[in-house]
């Protein structure tokens, strides 16, 4: 079956927006007014994953780009990256596990847990203009909660 996808933007719990920082990295910073046009638009695809009552498997691609957030080991540490894919084959229902995040949603707050590395989450720093990364702690200094805004 063809995969179902929605376009959206994400802001962290501090209301920082996500923007491109070079060709293969995202960073989080506060944007206002016209600068909001810089924020990346994601294509959130609803993909196959493990059955769970409160976790929805998704893939996060960048709209109109053949780039997907993926989780890989780098120097023995789970790491978030933007990975280039063949647009003829993506998105697809059965995404490779490194592309899959378990969306956990409570009261319109979203967390994205790596399916490849359980208990590792898409995270941002408290500081401005720092890279978006994969973090191994919730409820600490780093921010793992996001809000989502739909985009046409």
């Amino acid at each position: 079956a063809p995969v179902r996808s929605l376009h959206c933007t994400l802001r962290d719990a501090q209301l920082k927006s996500l923007v491109m920082s070079g060709p293969y990295e995202l960073k989080a910073l506060h944007l206002q007014g016209q600068d909001l046009e810089q924020q990346v638009v994601f294509s959130m695809s609803f993909v196959q994953g493990e059955e769970s009552n409160d976790k929805i498997p998704v893939a996060l691609g960048l709209k109109a780009k053949n780039l997907y957030l993926s989780c890989v080991l780098k120097d023995d540490k789970p790491t978030l990256q933007l990975e280039s894919v063949d647009p003829k084959n993506y998105p697809k229902k059965k995404m490779e596990k490194r592309f899959v995040f378990n969306k956990i949603e409570i009261n319109n707050k979203l967390e994205f847990e790596s399916a490849q590395f359980p208990n590792w989450y898409i995270s941002t720093s408290q500081a401005e203009s720092m890279p978006v990364f994969l973090g191994g702690t919730r409820g600490g200094q780093d921010i793992t909660d996001f809000t989502m805004q739909f985009v046409s």
């Epitope: 079956a1 929605l6 229902k93 949603e105 319109n108 739909f150």
Partner: antibody, heavy 120, light 107 residues
């Protein structure tokens, strides 16, 4: 609590149009797909299409393209379905229902239905 | 389009009976399968979604299961209020499609 309240029954002549409304309350309108389903007298259920008010995305059953037009007004938390060029076979009860944007929860809530009768 | 073949089309049973209704999908639907109950003149009522998850407020005598592309609704001990028509729905692929319905009648 969640409620979907549909507009009242309609009697239309062949060739006319009708617009059915579905007013929702009790949840964040923008985050749920509104589904439209029809049921002809004594028959089963048939999916017409859906709209996500948060971004205006619409998906139609090919069978109803050109027959049904689905819209939503986020200022009034109301979805609409207009049926054009009505024929006697469009006589049915039309239901609205909801499903969360990530498709996980199924068609959980339903409106009470709107009977559209097409008769000369 | 995905075909949902529902069986039986009608079923007579008594209060207290265990009843099963089956829907066979013509292809994989990734567990996007719901069950509904409908009484005459009323809107459908959602019972189960994603194969086996019970909607809030639905009695635990209702359960759902899957084996391959076969999906089953089971009512463990029929109550008088359970006599109605039941429909399955696949919502994995457009157009979403319902089974033809199973009318559950009192024996």
């Amino acid at each position: 609590q969640v409620q979907l309240v549909q507009s009242g029954a309609e009697v239309k002549k062949p060739g006319a149009s009708v617009k059915v409304s579905c007013k929702v309350s009790g949840y964040t309108f923008s985050r749920y797909w509104i589904e439209w389903v029809r049921q002809a007298p004594g028959k089963g259920l048939e999916w017409i299409g859906e709209i996500l008010p948060g971004n205006g995305n619409i998906n139609y059953n090919e069978k109803f393209k050109g027959k049904a037009t689905i819209t939503a007004d986020t200022s009034t938390d109301t979805a609409y379905m207009e049926l054009s060029s009505l024929r006697s076979e469009d006589t049915a009860v039309y239901y609205c229902s909801t499903i969360y944007y990530d498709y996980d929860q199924g068609f959980t809530y339903w409106g009470q239905g709107t009977l559209v009768t097409v008769s000369s | 389009d995905i075909q949902m073949t529902q069986s039986p089309s009608s079923l007579s049973a008594s209060v207290g009976d265990r009843v099963t209704i089956t829907c066979k999908a013509s292809q994989d639907i990734d567990r996007y399968l719901s069950w509904f109950q409908q009484k005459p003149g009323k809107a459908p009522k959602s019972l189960i979604y994603r194969v086996k998850r019970l909607v809030d407020g639905v009695p635990s005598r209702f359960s759902g299961s899957a084996s391959g592309t076969d999906y089953t609704l089971t009512i463990s001990s029929l109550q008088p209020e359970d006599f109605a028509t039941y429909y399955c729905l696949q919502y994995d692929e457009f157009p979403y499609t319902f089974g033809q319905g199973t009318k559950l009648e009192i024996k």
